[in-house]
């Protein structure tokens, strides 16, 4: 049994890091393998992650972490029984994929203005709470070409757009994702989408 693709890990910079790797053949990850991880710190203890299958030869493990700070470094040991298959390390702050925003809501009752709000996925005491920016994707269910992205570069988790920038009388969907420039993160997954019917009063044309 050998490792074909070494483990690569990403952290949500809160409580979970996810490591994925591939073996050189079909493997029952949960019965044959264990990933041991330990924070390099005087008071830390080793923890064991039981991997799950991710395709025939692929494995994935979700490492639970109390909290994360920028200097953290973890040792990783991948074992098959008594055999050490791979040894490595992982700095969560260098491989961050933020959590997806939640609770996306479209408020349509504000005088021909659409107000989209969502929740920051981090608690206020987490470093990323004040460092996230967002991308909002709005698209028409009727017209695949009607697809737009709004970049929200301020901290407030909201976006205002004029209803008239979208077509009236049709349904739209929106979703939002996050990233943090400070840690050069990847984008989060998209939030679940929300749907609304766009309607607004056309301005009265005078002749």
């Amino acid at each position: 049994m050998k490792v074909l693709q070494e483990p690569t890990c990403v952290s949500d910079y809160m409580s979970i890091s996810t490591c994925e790797w591939k073996m050189n053949g079909p493997t029952n990850c949960s019965t044959e393998l264990r990933l041991l991880y330990q924070l390099v710190f005087l008071l830390s203890e080793a923890h064991t992650c039981i991997p799950e299958n991710n395709g025939g030869a692929g494995c994935v493990c979700h490492l639970l972490m109390d909290d994360v700070v920028s200097a953290d470094n973890y040792t990783l040991d991948l074992w098959a029984g008594q055999q050490l298959l791979w040894k490595g390390s992982f700095k969560p702050s260098e491989h961050v994929k933020p959590r997806a925003p939640g609770n996306l809501t479209v408020h349509t009752n504000v005088s021909d203005t659409l107000l989209l709000t969502w929740s920051n996925p981090y608690p206020p005491d987490n470093y990323l709470y004040n460092h996230l920016t967002y991308a909002v994707n709005i698209w028409s269910e009727n017209d695949p070409a009607d697809f737009r992205i709004y970049n929200v570069t301020y901290l407030e988790p909201s976006l205002r757009i004029a209803a008239s920038t979208l077509k009236s009388g049709i349904s739209y969907r929106a979703r939002v994702r996050a990233w943090a420039q400070c840690y050069n993160t990847t984008w989060s997954e998209w939030s679940p989408s929300t749907k609304w019917h766009n309607s607004y009063r056309e301005p009265f044309e005078q002749h």
């Epitope: 109390d66 700070v69 200097a71």
Partner: antibody
Framework: EVQLQESGPGLVKPSETLSLTCTVS?????????WNWIRQPPGKGLEWIGY???????SYNPSLKSRVTISVDTSKNQFSLKLSSVTAADTAVYYC?????????????WGQGTTVTVSS | DIQLTQSPSFLSASVGDRVTITCRAT?????MHWYQQKPGKAPKPWIY???NLASGVPSRFSGSGSGTEFTLTISSLQPEDFATYYC?????????FGQGTKLEIK
């Protein structure tokens, strides 16, 4: 809320053993964290003495190791410091404090301190 | 032992000033903490793991650094900030503190 309270004699004679107890309320010392003793001589800086962890393992400052014992009484939720063969140089305010894996060892809760004078 | 040296040891400054305190270590440190102490009181946790503010610490405080050099910065001094500040490392036994920086009103 977590609270720590030091207690023990304020005056110890040279060559005797200094004994202090830290009573913890609001948190079980056998649950987690390292439970530390730190001292501060008059007008000087802070010196770490040692800790005992929730699991019972201990670690001491090598400069004091031969004279120090830190023990725990989980039934009373207390941990104690014994420092033998004291001299005037051991005169200080003695603090107990909690430090753990979360926040990477930060001493997040401290006792108010108890003054110990070594004098005949 | 990892020795920590703070500079300056004494600092006179005025309300509104920007102030920086440096802590240098004789060996590389992973986790550096800072405490604030006022006369007759126990130290209070102030900044943990280099840059994270402890609970209740005002945002005018910040921490930075890595390896052997770390700093605590106050962007605009307030009257309640005059105190002694200590750095402390959790990278190796014995745990050690800096000698302290006493911040006084000019």
């Amino acid at each position: 809320e977590v609270q720590l309270q030091e207690s023990g004699p304020g005056l110890v004679k040279p060559s005797e053993t200094l004994s202090l107890t830290c009573t913890v309320s609001g948190y079980s010392i056998s649950s987690d964290y390292a439970w530390n003793w730190i001292r501060q001589p008059p007008g000087k800086g802070l010196e770490w003495i040692g800790y005992i962890s929730y699991s019972g393992s201990s670690s001491y400052n090598p400069s004091l190791k031969s004279r120090v014992t830190i023990s725990v009484d989980t039934s009373k939720n207390q941990f104690s410091l014994k420092l033998s063969s004291v001299t005037a140089a051991d005169t200080a305010v003695y603090y107990c404090a909690r430090g753990g894996l979360r926040r990477r060892g930060l001493f997040d809760y401290w006792g108010q301190g108890t003054t110990v004078t070594v004098s005949s | 032992d990892i020795q920590l040296t703070q500079s300056p040891s004494f600092l006179s400054a005025s309300v509104g000033d920007r102030v920086t305190i440096t802590c240098r270590a004789t060996s590389s440190v992973t986790y550096m903490h800072w405490y604030q102490q006022k006369p007759g009181k126990a130290p209070k946790p102030w900044i943990y793991a280099t840059s994270n503010l402890a609970s209740g610490v005002p945002s005018r405080f910040s921490g930075s650094g890595s390896g052997t050099e770390f700093t605590l910065t106050i962007s605009s001094l307030q009257p309640e900030d005059f105190a002694t500040y200590y750095c402390q490392q959790w990278s190796s036994i014995p745990l050690t503190f800096g000698q302290g920086t006493k911040l006084e009103i000019k």
